[in-house]
């Protein structure tokens, strides 16, 4: 089921999916002066069963100017840039993603896609959040948020992280030592 | 209590365009995106796009993608769906419905109907 | 794009019988939703997340289902249940309805 919202803005944070759960969609955008192909796919689609995951579908950029010629490569891990995770991020380097079952890797970039990826979540998804860069993270709890359905209803619940004015930066989990397990995390369910 | 009002009835020519507004009140007007879906006369349902009044980000049913532009005004916690290059076919009643999940509340719809 | 079949198009019955449509769905999806609308009137929340009764809707209604076979029941139809049934997913885009089931008197 969709997340029909966005995850929680925290001040001076940013914040990322490790992986992204079965049912997750990416959108297919190209960078300025290219476009989706005429027949290509407007998502990229996270599926499969317990045991293995993959994106289908496979995003294809061509340029505006040319009718006939497509691009679509699948790089190796050193060409990989910088992107963003949803249309409100700052770019973050990908991190090392342990395979979790039933969820997909972030998909490798391909040939002109547009700065910013926009992935529609579902329920159940969880990002992390981290500080940017010249601010420091004060933890109440878990940097984290989780996509849940109350009444028909998706919310994402607030992450336990402030950024203060400091020269030094927090990372995500697997770039540091572990922080409070989730199983801290006060739930403040909304009412009906 | 929520409330999404919708305008009024339009009659367009063909090759013109049309704008809907639903004016919500009783929640906070950015904290949900606000959906569009469409009934052709006598036909069933069909979802059109959303808004995120919050940034204007918006995401369309690719039938739709070069019929209809939706936008949102977060003063007046309106958000609106113009409607270009009108076609007989695009004679129908249009609604809003108010997104985060299921579709809990909806406007009384806009009947906009298109002959020459 | 997922596709929900809905069946039957038309059902004939009378006030007191137990009435079931089904909405099959192209792809097996999360949940289903189910809305009632009558004659010139806006869609209205019936069933969410496949059994889910909304606020105000009588115990009459009960949902059920999983993966692409879902079913809409009314164990006892009253005279305000005359209406057009619509099945709906929201586990992808484009979001989908069924054609709908209108529920006429017999």
């Known amino acids: 089921e969709l997340c029909d919202d966005d995850p929680p803005e925290i001040p001076h944070a940013t914040f990322k999916a490790m992986a992204y759960k079965e049912g997750t969609m990416l959108n297919c955008e190209c960078k300025r002066g290219f476009r989706r192909i005429k027949s290509g796919s407007l998502y990229m689609l996270c599926t499969g069963n317990s045991s293995h995951s993959s994106w289908d579908n496979q995003c294809q950029c061509t340029s505006s100017a040319t009718r006939n010629t497509t691009k679509q490569v699948t790089p190796q891990p050193e060409e990989q840039k910088e992107r963003k995770t949803t249309e409100m991020q700052s770019p973050m380097q990908p991190v090392d993603q342990a395979s979790l079952p039933g969820h997909c890797r972030e998909p490798p970039p391909w040939e002109n896609e547009a700065t910013e990826r926009i992935y529609h979540f579902v329920v159940g998804q969880m990002v992390y959040y981290q500080c940017v860069q010249g601010y420091r993270a004060l933890h109440r709890g878990p940097a984290e948020s989780v996509c849940k359905m109350t009444h028909g209803k998706t919310r994402w619940t607030q992450p336990q992280l402030i950024c203060t004015g400091e020269m030094e930066t927090s990372q995500f989990p697997g770039e540091e030592k572990p922080q409070a397990s989730p199983e801290g995390r006060p739930e403040s369910e909304t009412s009906c | 209590q929520v409330q999404l009002v919708q305008s009024g009835a339009e009659v367009k020519k063909p090759g013109s365009s049309v704008k809907v507004s639903c004016k919500a009140s009783g929640y906070t007007f950015t904290s949900y995106r606000m959906h569009w879906v469409r009934q052709a006369p006598g036909q069933g349902l069909e979802w059109m796009g959303y808004i995120k009044p919050s940034r204007g980000y918006t995401e369309y049913n690719q039938k739709f993608k070069d019929k209809a532009t939706i936008t949102a005004d977060e003063s007046t916690n309106t958000a609106y769906m113009e409607l270009s290059s009108l076609r007989s076919e695009d004679t129908a009643v249009y609604y809003c419905a108010r997104g985060g999940g299921v579709f809990d509340y909806w406007g009384q719809g806009t009947l906009v109907t298109v002959s020459s | 794009d997922i596709q929900m079949t809905q069946s039957p198009s038309t059902l004939s019955a009378s006030v007191g019988d137990r009435v079931t449509i089904t909405c099959s769905a192209s792809s097996k999806i999360s949940y289903m939703h189910w809305y009632q609308q009558k004659p010139g009137k806006a869609p209205k929340l019936l069933i969410y997340?496949?059994?889910d009764l909304a606020s105000g809707v009588p115990a009459r209604f009960s949902g059920s289902g999983s993966g692409t076979e879902f079913t809409l029941t009314i164990s006892s139809l009253q005279p305000d249940d005359f209406a057009t049934y619509y099945c709906?997913?929201?586990?992808?885009?484009?979001?989908?309805f069924g054609q709908g089931t209108k529920v006429e008197v017999k």
């Open positions: 997340t496949t059994s």
């Open positions: 709906h997913q929201r586990s992808t885009y484009p979001l989908t």
